[in-house]
Interface confidence: medium
Amino acid sequence: KVFGRCELAAAMKRHGLDNYRGYSLGNWVCAAKFESNFNTQATNRNTDGSTDYGILQINSRWWCNDGRTPGSRNLCNIPCSALLSSDITASVNCAKKIVSDGNGMNAWVAWRNRCKGTDVQAWIRGCRL
């Protein structure tokens, strides 16, 4: 599923991401935009043999199990395919674990490069939340 901007903002808010670990909803929507272009079925392969999955591009070396990433830790204890569902529950729950890990949203390269320090509230402007 490819979410609309405000549709995703509303779904993320319902799942408790607004101000989770101090990150406003705009940060999460911005991250999703530049990680996956709001596409729940996005997959991207990395040079280390791991793959990033879903709307928040969660990595198989650390967070989920895709059955083929050497040394996978599967810290979210889920199959990576669950992160590709049109229901973003699994991605949100895993993202909460990632953002609580110590580096905050710096774990997402796209957030660090495209969202951090910008007017992230613009990503939820005009949305009925």
Partner: antibody, heavy 116, light 107 residues
């Protein structure tokens, strides 16, 4: 136990298309990548590409882009590979395998013969 | 693409001999190297994964070693059922690639 069952041998004319199937049993089909591999005598094994059935995400070896198309039906636990514009170079045995980085589980292979 | 070169192309041995098969990668692939056996008209069978880890049900006479770019499959005291083709495969990057194979034949 995990099994991959491929469709039977095919004889096709040049220019035609063929669709090979790979039915998976014994595991959660949507969760694992299915890989496709080509084997021609004297050419060894060639990786064609892969599909993740749960999402339909696909990756292709550049060499096979435009030649192979992968699909999957999660209701029947079956992956498909369509080969188009067939030539004699496409005559080969085609395998599906479960994509665990290494391939422990393989189908029995589908022999494709392209001949006028 | 990563190229895998296997040598020798053919190895003629007598049952009971011990042999080593080589696989060389065109660039470092860490430990992401796997070995397969294939007999005529059969699907490949995984022998060794990640350089040295034995696959389920594989006899202990098969072992693997190496790192980086140079890898070896060793068979200690070859048995008649071991004759066939052997392929290496890398999973360090895409596209996945296989070596050209080594044919193990009876002398």
């Amino acid at each position: 136990q995990v099994q991959l069952q491929e469709s039977g041998a095919e004889v096709m004319k040049p220019g035609a298309s063929v669709k090979i199937s790979c039915k998976a049993t014994g595991y959660t089909f949507s969760t694992y990548w299915i890989e496709w591999v080509k084997q021609r005598p004297g050419h060894g094994l060639e990786w064609i590409g892969e599909i993740l059935p749960g999402s339909g995400s696909t990756y292709y070896n550049e060499k096979f882009k435009g030649k192979a198309t992968f699909t999957a039906d999660t209701s029947s636990n079956t992956a498909y590979m369509q080969l188009s514009s067939l030539t004699s170079e496409d005559s080969a045995v085609y395998y599906c395998a479960r994509g665990d980085g290494n391939y422990y589980y393989w189908g029995q292979g589908t022999t494709l013969t392209v001949s006028s | 693409d990563i190229e895998l070169t296997q040598s020798p192309a053919t190895l003629s041995v007598t049952p009971g001999d011990s042999v080593s098969l080589s696989c060389r990668a065109s660039q470092s692939i860490s430990n992401n190297l796997h070995w397969y056996q294939q007999k005529s008209h059969e699907s490949p069978r995984l022998l060794i994964k990640y350089v040295s880890q034995s696959s389920s049900g594989i006899p202990s006479r098969f072992s693997g070693s190496g790192s980086g770019t140079d890898f070896t499959l060793s068979i200690n005291s070859v048995e008649t059922e071991d004759f066939g083709m052997y392929f290496c495969q890398q999973s360090n990057s895409w596209p996945r690639t296989f070596g050209g194979g080594t044919k193990l034949e009876i002398k």
